[in-house]
Interface confidence: low
């Protein structure tokens, strides 16, 4: 008769570092001792007629149990194989680019450490909850790629991978871990520069605007912006419309830059650099400063009128040009009372880069001079008629401008001048008319004839 | 830490040339302007120039200008002055130093290097 | 070129008194967006100038508050308040408003 030893469970299944009871059991009436065989850390629990109880500890990989016993003289077997599974200890998805190009492949790449039994094992790398790639986990550590072609839409997008272990054949489910997530930024940047809009030229100490636009810049708002001139950093302010991003800051020339210098506006974006430079040239352009040597002459007196400017200016007083740029125009004139509120001009004309800057600046020369009635304005007879409407058109002269009056010879009586008033023959006389100013008095005598009013 | 640190002395014969450097560290070199100055017993300090190491853009004390040369390496973070026919009156401690853009103080100065001309 | 002019050539002082060094330019170191750009430097012997003030009144990071400037235009002044050995040096005034930037000649603090 041919007698069995049986061994329980048979191929179980359990997690790693676990612990097992196995039981060895015969049906043969004159078995001897049954005796486990196998490298686990083993201890005997019980043993009785035809049967003995194990306890398995620490069970941390694959085994094959075998139980044995003697039984009339004839050695009988019985074995188990024990399937052992753990979950991985590391699942890592690797950094992704700082910043990624869109329309460029990149590959995404998962390490995982560990885990059992690999025939069991999956790894899945995922886009949000998408799966990009789904394989098996093969040698250790595992390592699992997939390129991605990078879109817009991917900016900001989270990538990670996970592990299934599939024990549901055993009746234990489905194990799963997931690595940290890492978000993706993708960015494009044309291969133009930008456009940067700034004056050719730049006088000293005045500003002007500058503007550097790019335009299919994504995301925009992440663009860095540098504008300078020559060493000097602009404060630039940063406008994002859509995929353009437009800078724009005030230039302010220095008098320590002078001479031909290089606007500069960068963009960075995604560790790339697009580069627009503009010359410039700083100039310096004071004046034309024109000068009286006395602002208020005396009539008679020698005034000089002078003009001067910056270095390599040419100026051109009243039409007179300098002798050379650089220099000073000047001219003198013996003050007359005709020179009273004359205005003296100056042009200043500069050379920068092939092109002619003008400038203008006047100034007036007041003469002083005595008062004077003009002689063509008042008529010394006049002829009026008794009741009518007239104007004595007296004009008086003189800087300071004077007073003018118009008083009857031996009376207090006054006429106005210069405004509308009825005539009558109380007017008829000889008048004083007298320009009286600071610098002295002028009199001409103006007799009014006036004909009585006839009723016939 | 901020540091600029100088190459060592030199002692070289009149008529040539030498080229002293100045390796920035702790900051990024390309934010800052590099300044080179002189210092000699009888003069003083003196200032010889400034060089911009992001575009490499250069400012001379005219009394340098064709004696002293700046350069820069930004891959190495280096600032180089080279000083040409060489004389005993170019004999002195130089030092590089940065400042923030214009125009303000020297912020961080080398530990100088020292140039004696003698045949 | 602005030139500036220190004085006193040599300042001794007894530790715990209060010094002051004056500095003059040539020309007004005021620059055209306001600012005036005149710093003090002090060179410890044997070592390189340090930065104590910054645009005439400005105390640099890690300079005590016994270092005090004022001035403008052209005529500037360091304050210490209390000298203590380790302010031993000489002091330079320097001015970046002008192309060159120019150094004054230098004060030197010593132990009467």
């Known amino acids: 008769q041919e007698f069995l030893l049986r061994v329980e469970p048979q191929n179980p299944v359990l997690s790693a570092g676990g612990s097992l009871f196995v039981n060895c059991s015969t049906d043969c009436p004159s078995s001897e001792k049954i005796a486990l065989e196998t490298s686990l850390s083993k201890a005997l629990v019980a043993s009785g007629m035809g049967w003995a109880a194990f306890n398995l500890s620490n069970v941390t990989g694959n085994s094959r149990i075998l139980c044995s016993v003697y039984c009339n003289g004839s050695q009988i077997t019985g074995s188990s194989n024990i399937t052992v599974y753990g979950l991985p200890e590391r699942v890592e998805l690797a950094p992704l680019p700082p910043w990624q190009p869109v329309g460029q492949n990149f590959t995404l790449r998962c390490q995982v450490e560990g885990g059992s039994p690999r025939t069991s094992l999956t790894v899945v790398l995922l886009r949000w909850e998408e799966e990009l790639s789904r394989q098996p986990a093969v040698e250790e550590p595992a390592e699992v790629t997939a390129t991605v072609l990078a879109s817009r839409d991917d900016h900001g997008a989270p990538f990670s991978c996970r592990t299934e272990l599939d024990m549901q054949p055993q009746g234990l489910g489905l194990f799963v871990n997931t690595s940290a997530p890492r978000q993706l930024r993708t960015f494009v940047l044309p291969v133009t520069p930008p456009r940067l809009v700034a004056p050719r030229f730049l006088e000293v100490e005045t500003s002007w605007p500058v503007d550097c636009t790019l335009d299919g810049l994504f995301p925009a708002s992440e663009a860095q912006v540098y504008l300078a001139l020559g060493d000097q950093m602009l404060n630039a302010t940063v406008m994002n419309h859509g995929d353009t991003l437009t800078a724009t800051a005030t230039a302010t020339a220095r008098a320590d830059q002078e001479g031909a210098r290089e606007i500069v506006c960068n963009v960075t974006l995604g560790g790339e650099r697009r580069e627009a430079r503009e010359n410039l040239t700083v100039f310096s352009f004071l004046g034309p400063i024109v000068n009286l040597s006395e602002p208020t002459a005396h009539e008679g007196s020698t005034v000089t009128v002078s003009c001067m400017a910056g270095a390599r200016v040419q100026v051109t007083l009243d039409g007179v040009p300098a002798a050379a740029p650089g220099q000073t125009a000047q001219l003198q004139l013996n003050a007359t009372e005709s020179d009273d509120g004359r205005s003296f001009f100056c042009s200043a004309t500069l050379e920068v880069d092939g092109e002619f800057l003008h400038r203008n600046s006047s100034v007036q020369l007041r003469v002083l001079y005595g008062p004077k009635i003009d002689r063509a304005t008042c008529p010394q007879h006049l002829k009026w008629k008794d009741k009518t409407r007239h104007v004595l058109q007296c004009q008086a002269r003189g800087n300071p401008y004077p007073e003018l009056r118009c008083l009857k010879e031996g009376s207090s009586r006054e006429v106005p001048v210069g405004i509308p008033f009825f005539v009558n023959v109380t007017h008829n006389g000889t008048y004083q008319c007298q320009a009286s100013s600071s610098r002295g008095k002028y009199t001409l005598v103006v007799v009014m004839d006036i004909e009585a009013f006839s009723s016939h | 830490e901020i540091q600029l640190q100088q190459t060592g002395p030199e002692l070289v014969k009149p008529g040539a040339s030498v080229k002293i450097s100045c390796k920035a560290s702790?900051?990024?070199?390309?934010?800052?302007?590099i300044l080179w100055v002189k210092q000699s017993h009888g003069k003083g300090l003196e200032w010889i120039g400034k060089?911009?190491?992001?575009?490499?853009?250069?400012t001379y004390n005219l009394k340098f200008k064709g004696k002293a040369t700046l350069t820069v390496d930004k891959s190495s973070s280096t600032a180089h002055m080279q000083l040409n026919s060489l004389t005993s009156e170019d004999s002195a401690v130089y030092y590089c130093?940065?400042?923030?853009?214009?125009?303000?103080?020297?912020?961080?100065w080398g530990q100088g290097t020292s140039v004696t001309v003698s045949s | 070129d602005a030139v500036m002019t220190q004085t006193p050539l040599s300042l001794p002082v007894s530790l715990g008194d209060q010094a002051s060094i004056s500095c003059r330019s040539s020309?007004?170191?005021?620059?055209?967006?306001?600012?005036?750009?005149l710093h003090w430097y002090l060179q410890k012997p044997g070592q390189s100038p340090q930065l104590l003030i910054y645009?005439?009144?400005n105390r640099f990071s890690g300079v005590p508050d016994r270092f005090s400037g004022s001035g403008s235009g052209t005529d500037f002044t360091l304050k210490l308040s209390r000298v203590e050995a380790e302010d031993l040096g000489v002091y330079f005034c320097?001015?970046?408003?002008?192309?060159?930037?120019?150094f004054g000649g230098g004060t030197k603090l010593e132990i009467k």
């Open positions: 130093a940065r400042k923030e853009a214009y125009p303000d103080a020297m912020d961080y």
């Open positions: 702790g900051y990024s070199f390309t934010d800052c302007i």
């Open positions: 060089i911009n190491p992001y575009f490499g853009t250069t």
């Open positions: 020309q007004s170191l005021v620059h055209s967006n306001g600012d005036t750009y």
């Open positions: 645009k005439v009144s």
């Open positions: 320097s001015q970046s408003t002008h192309v060159p930037y120019t």
